[in-house]
C-alpha cells in the first residue's frame, strides 16, 4: 500500500540502485517514485554531513522484502517511494531553494528581475531542467539578476552548493505549465534522426511516447512496430534529443512511428502509467512471482498491488490453467520495460498501475459568512483541490469554496446551503484559477446529494460542515486532485505552514475576486481564540487562524473553502472556512471547522452513501 511517513535522523542501509543530488527530501522522494526499481530512499541535507561530496545526496534503494535496516544518522531523512499513492504521484516540483546553487550544464544566461521570472524562462525553454538565479544582493555585481538555465544527463543537478544570495529550482514543465505547447501528432512510417538517449522495448508507440515524456532528456522518439523488417529491432522505442530541441531530419520508413515528448503540453500531461492490456503478447523479464488468478484484469490488479511488479503476462496455455484460473507471471526489469516482447502467444500482457494518478476511488484521508484579505494571486495547479460552488438562478454567481476530497466528493461548510438546499441550482467548478474563464461551455459538476451535518443549526457556528456527492466522478489531473484529510483526532501535529484560499472578498465591503487568492496564516490556540470571541463558544471542533495585527484573513465568499497545512512535504485539510467577526480585523482570527474532529462522520457518510470505503487516512 501507500506509505507516506518520513523517518527523521534515519538512513536506510544497503539496497542502493541509484544516487543523485537533490535539494530536499521531497524531491528525492519524487525521484524514487519515478525510478522503476526504487522503493525506499535516504536523503542527506547539507547540515547532516561534513563530507561535501555527500551533501544533498539522495540515495535510491530497492529491497526484495520492501524494507531495509535503518541506522541512526543525525539530520538524515528517509522514506518510501509514493508508488501506489494515486493522486499524490506527481513529477511537478514548485519549490524554490534559497541559498542554494544547483549545478549543471549552463546553456543560457539572461538578466531577469525575479526568481519567478527565471523559473518561468526555464519552464518555457524546451531543454531547461533546472535553474539558478543570482539575487540583487549577490556578492559579484556583474552576476546579479543572472538567470542560468541548466540541464544534466540525469535531469538532476550534478552538484548542489550552499551559496548566499542564489536561488534555485526546477522547470515547471511537469506541472503542465509550459507555454511552449506540444505536438500531439504521431507520424506513421517516419523515423527521426539525432541522438539516442535511451532504448527500451514497448508494445506500442503510445507507451513509447509516455516513457519519452517522463524521461529527463527525451524530446522526441521513434518506435519500430512489431512488423518492422528487422526482427531484432521490433518494438524498439528509441528516445531521442537534439541541440535544437527538434529532429534535424526525418526519413520515410515503413512500419516506424515517430512523435514528440508531451512534457511541454499545457494543462494536461499523460498519466505516468500504461493501463492497456495487450492480447496475444508476452512480456519477458525477471520473474518476481507466479500466481493463479481468474482473468487478465485480476492479474493486472495483482501486479499493481505487489509494489515491485512492473509488468505481467497472463498465460492461457492449457498447461498453465486449472479450472477457471490461469498463471499470472509477475515480472520486473532494470528499466521498468519488458526485456522481450513476443507476439502470437496464448497470453495477454500489460503493466502495473502503481504509478497511475487516479488509483481507485479511495482518497488519502491521510458567524459571518466568511475572500481572502491581504492575499496574493495563486498560480495554476497550486491548490488543485479548490472548487468554486456556484448558484445558477436567473444569473450565475460564486457563493462558496469547497475542497475536493475524492473522485466524487467535495467537503464544504454547511452554512453555504442556508436557504439554498436545492441541489439542482448548484454548479461545481473544479480545476479552475480565474472565475472569468468560466463560460457557458465550461464543464461543471452537478450535485447528486448534499449531506449536512445532523447537528448543524442555521446561524450557529457549530458543526459547520457538509459533504457534497457529485453526480459523476472526476478524473484527477495536475489541476484537479484531492486534498488529504488529517488522521482522526489529529491533535499532536504542530502545523507551522498553513494557507487559506478562495475567491472571496478582498475587503470587508468588497467583491468576489477573479483570480484565486492565497494567504499564509498562522494557527491560533483555542484558548487565545476564545479570548478574542468572548460572546461565542470556541469548541474543540473548531480551529482558529489569524495574525494578531489582522490584515490577512478569509472573507465573504471564501466559506467552505480550505485551510490547508503542509507537514512533512504533504498538504492536509486542517480546516473549513466557517466564520469570523468581520474580515482581517485586529485580534479577530478566522474560525474554521476542525476537519480532524469530523473524520468518523466523513468516513461514515462517504461509505454509507455507496457501500464502500472512499477514504483512507495517510499511514
Amino acid at each position: 500500500g501507500c506509505l507516506t511517513q518520513l523517518y527523521e535522523n534515519a538512513f536506510f542501509r544497503g539496497g542502493d540502485v541509484a544516487s543523485m543530488y537533490t535539494p530536499n527530501a521531497q524531491y528525492c522522494q519524487m525521484r524514487c517514485t519515478f525510478h522503476p526499481r526504487c522503493l525506499l530512499f535516504s536523503f542527506l541535507p547539507a547540515s547532516s554531513i561534513n563530507d561535501m561530496e555527500k551533501r544533498f545526496g539522495c540515495f535510491l534503494k530497492d529491497s526484495v522484502t520492501g524494507t531495509l535496516p535503518k541506522v541512526h544518522r543525525t539530520g538524515a531523512v528517509s522514506g518510501h517511494s509514493l508508488k501506489q499513492c494515486g493522486h499524490q504521484i506527481s513529477a511537478c516540483h514548485r519549490d524554490i531553494y534559497k541559498g542554494v546553487d544547483m549545478r549543471g550544464v549552463n546553456f543560457n544566461v539572461s538578466k531577469v528581475s525575479s526568481v519567478e521570472e527565471c523559473q518561468k524562462r526555464c519552464t518555457s525553454n524546451i531543454r531547461c531542467q533546472f535553474f539558478s538565479y543570482a539575487t540583487q544582493t549577490f556578492h559579484k555585481a556583474e552576476y546579479r539578476n543572472n538567470c542560468l538555465l541548466k540541464y544534466s544527463p540525469g535531469g538532476t543537478p550534478t552538484a548542489i552548493k550552499v551559496l548566499s544570495n542564489v536561488e534555485s529550482g526546477f522547470s515547471l514543465k511537469p506541472c503542465a505549465l509550459s507555454e511552449i505547447g506540444c505536438h500531439m501528432n504521431i507520424f506513421q512510417h517516419l523515423a527521426f534522426s539525432d541522438v539516442d538517449v535511451a532504448r527500451v522495448l514497448t508494445p506500442d508507440a503510445f507507451v513509447c511516447r509516455t516513457i519519452c515524456t517522463y524521461h529527463p532528456n527525451c524530446l522526441f522518439f521513434t518506435f519500430y512496430t512489431n512488423v518492422w523488417k528487422i526482427e531484432s529491432q521490433r518494438n524498439v522505442c528509441l528516445l531521442k534529443t537534439s541541440e535544437s530541441g527538434t529532429p534535424s531530419s526525418s526519413t520515410p520508413q515503413e512500419n516506424t512511428i515517430s512523435g514528440y515528448s508531451l512534457l511541454t503540453c499545457k494543462r494536461t500531461l499523460p498519466e505516468p502509467c500504461h493501463s492497456k492490456i495487450y492480447p496475444g503478447v508476452d512480456f519477458g523479464g525477471e520473474e518476481l512471482n507466479v500466481t493463479f488468478v481468474k482473468g487478465v484484469n485480476v492479474c493486472q490488479e495483482t501486479c499493481t498491488k505487489m509494489i515491485r511488479c512492473q509488468f505481467f503476462t497472463y498465460s492461457l496455455l492449457p498447461e498453465d490453467c486449472k479450472e477457471e484460473k490461469c498463471k499470472c507471471f509477475l515480472r520486473l526489469s532494470m528499466d521498468g520495460s519488458p526485456t522481450r516482447i513476443a507476439y502470437g502467444t496464448q497470453g495477454s500482457s500489460g503493466y502495473s498501475l502503481r504509478l497511475c494518478n487516479t488509483g481507485d476511488n479511495s482518497v488519502c484521508t491521510t458567524k459571518t459568512s466568511t475572500r481572502i484579505v491581504g492575499g496574493t494571486n495563486s498560480s495554476w495547479g497550486e491548490w488543485p483541490w479548490q472548487v468554486s460552488l456556484q448558484v445558477k438562478l436567473t444569473a450565475q454567481r460564486h457563493l462558496c469554496g469547497g475542497s475536493l476530497i475524492g473522485h466524487q466528493w467535495v467537503l464544504t461548510a454547511a452554512h453555504c446551503f442556508d436557504g439554498l438546499p436545492l441541489q439542482d441550482v448548484w454548479r461545481i467548478y473544479s480545476g479552475i484559477l480565474n472565475l472569468s474563464d468560466i463560460t457557458k461551455d465550461t464543464p461543471f459538476s452537478q450535485i447528486k446529494e448534499i449531506i449536512i451535518h445532523q447537528n448543524y443549526k442555521v446561524s450557529e457556528g457549530n458543526h459547520d460542515i457538509a459533504l457534497i456527492k457529485l453526480q459523476a466522478p472526476l478524473n484527477y489531473t495536475e489541476f484537479q486532485k484531492p486534498i488529504c484529510l488529517p488522521s482522526k483526532g489529529d491533535t499532536s501535529t504542530i502545523y507551522t505552514n498553513c494557507w487559506v484560499t478562495g475567491w472571496g472578498f478582498s475587503k470587508e465591503k468588497g467583491e468576489i475576486q477573479n483570480i484565486l487568492q492565497k494567504v499564509n496564516i498562522p494557527l491560533v490556540t483555542n484558548e487565545e481564540c476564545q479570548k478574542r470571541y468572548q460572546d461565542y463558544k470556541i469548541t474543540q471542533r473548531m480551529v482558529c487562524a489569524g495574525y494578531k495585527e489582522g490584515g490577512k484573513d478569509a472573507c465573504k465568499g471564501d466559506s467552505g473553502g480550505p485551510l490547508v497545512c503542509k507537514h512533512n512535504g504533504m498538504w492536509r485539510l486542517v480546516g473549513i472556512t466557517s466564520w469570523g467577526e468581520g474580515c482581517a480585523r485586529r485580534e479577530q482570527p478566522g474560525v474554521y471547522t476542525k476537519v480532524a474532529e469530523y473524520m468518523d462522520w466523513i468516513l461514515e457518510k462517504t461509505q454509507s452513501s455507496d457501500g464502500k470505503a472512499q477514504m483512507q487516512s495517510p499511514a
Epitope: 500531439m184 501528432n185 504521431i186 506513421q188 506500442d204 508507440a205 503510445f206 512496430t225 512489431n226 512488423v227 512500419n255 512511428i257 499523460p270 498519466e271 500504461h274 493501463s275 492497456k276 492490456i277 492480447p279 496475444g280 487478465v296 484484469n297 492461457l316 507476439y343 502470437g344 502467444t345 496464448q346 497470453g347 495477454s348 487516479t358 478524473n475
Partner: antibody
C-alpha cells in the same frame, strides 16, 4: 494494394451453419491480429471475434461464445469464421478487419458479407 | 465490458459547419479511442486512432481530442462527402466496444 475480401455469406435456417472466409492481400498477413465485426440491419457495429497473428490466441463476444470459431491459415493469407447453431439475432453484415500494430484500431476493413438467418 | 456512450445519436448540419461528436467511456481508457466513418452500404473507415492521431489519407478537417473517459471528434468545415454515420470504439481492453453511432445528416 492492401485489401480484405469476405465471402461465404448467404441464407441459412436457424440452427444451421455457415463458414465465412476473408482473403487478405497487399500486406504480411501472418504478422497481424485479425477481427470479425458484424452489423445487424439498421444497427451499430458489434465486435464478434479476435485471433492473434499465429492463431494461438482467440477470443469471442459472449453472444457467440461456444457457437462460432475463428481460425486462420497464414500460408493461404485467409481468415475464417465458422458459425454454428445460427440464430435470428446473428443476421448481419459480417466484416473482417485488420488490427493495426500501432494502436489496435481496425485500420483495414473488408467490404462485408451478408448472413441472413431465416426459416 | 467497457460501455461507450456516444452523443448525439443524430444531428443536422450544413456544408461549412463545425460539427462536434462526443464519446464517453464507462471507465478510463487512456488514449485508446478510435473514430470510424461509415457511409450507407459501405464498410467503416478508420479516421482517427489513439484519440487524436489522424489516419493516413484522412483530411485535416477531422480532429480528435480527449483522454481518460471523455473524447471528442470535430469536423471543422463540413463537406458534402462527410454526411455519414460516425462510431467511436475503445481498443484499451478486450472486448473492443463501439458507441452506438452518430448520424450526421443534411439540414
Amino acid at each position: 494494394e492492401v485489401q480484405l475480401l469476405e465471402s461465404g455469406g448467404g441464407l441459412v435456417q436457424p440452427g444451421g451453419s455457415l463458414r465465412l472466409s476473408c482473403a487478405a492481400s497487399g500486406f504480411t498477413f501472418s504478422m497481424y491480429p485479425m477481427m470479425w465485426v458484424r452489423q445487424a440491419p439498421g444497427k451499430g457495429l458489434e465486435w464478434v471475434s479476435y485471433i492473434s497473428p499465429s492463431g494461438g490466441m482467440t477470443d469471442y463476444a459472449d453472444s457467440v461464445k461456444g457457437r462460432f470459431t475463428i481460425s486462420r491459415d497464414n500460408s493461404k493469407n485467409t481468415l475464417y469464421l465458422q458459425m454454428n447453431s445460427l440464430r435470428a439475432e446473428d443476421m448481419a453484415v459480417y466484416y473482417c478487419a485488420r488490427v493495426a500494430g500501432s494502436s489496435d484500431a481496425f485500420d483495414i476493413w473488408g467490404q462485408g458479407t451478408m448472413v441472413t438467418v431465416s426459416s | 465490458d467497457i460501455q461507450m456512450t456516444q452523443s448525439p445519436s443524430s444531428l443536422s448540419a450544413s456544408v461549412g459547419d463545425r460539427v462536434t461528436i462526443t464519446c464517453r467511456a464507462s471507465q478510463s481508457i487512456s488514449i485508446y479511442l478510435n473514430w470510424y466513418q461509415q457511409k450507407p452500404e459501405k464498410a467503416p473507415k478508420l479516421l482517427i486512432f489513439a484519440a487524436s492521431t489522424l489516419q493516413s489519407g484522412v483530411p485535416s478537417r477531422f480532429s480528435g481530442s480527449g483522454s481518460g473517459t471523455d473524447f471528442t471528434l470535430t469536423i471543422s468545415n463540413l463537406q458534402p462527402e462527410d454526411f455519414a454515420t460516425y462510431y467511436c470504439q475503445q481498443s484499451h481492453s478486450i472486448p473492443p466496444t463501439f458507441g452506438l453511432g452518430t448520424k450526421v445528416e443534411v439540414k
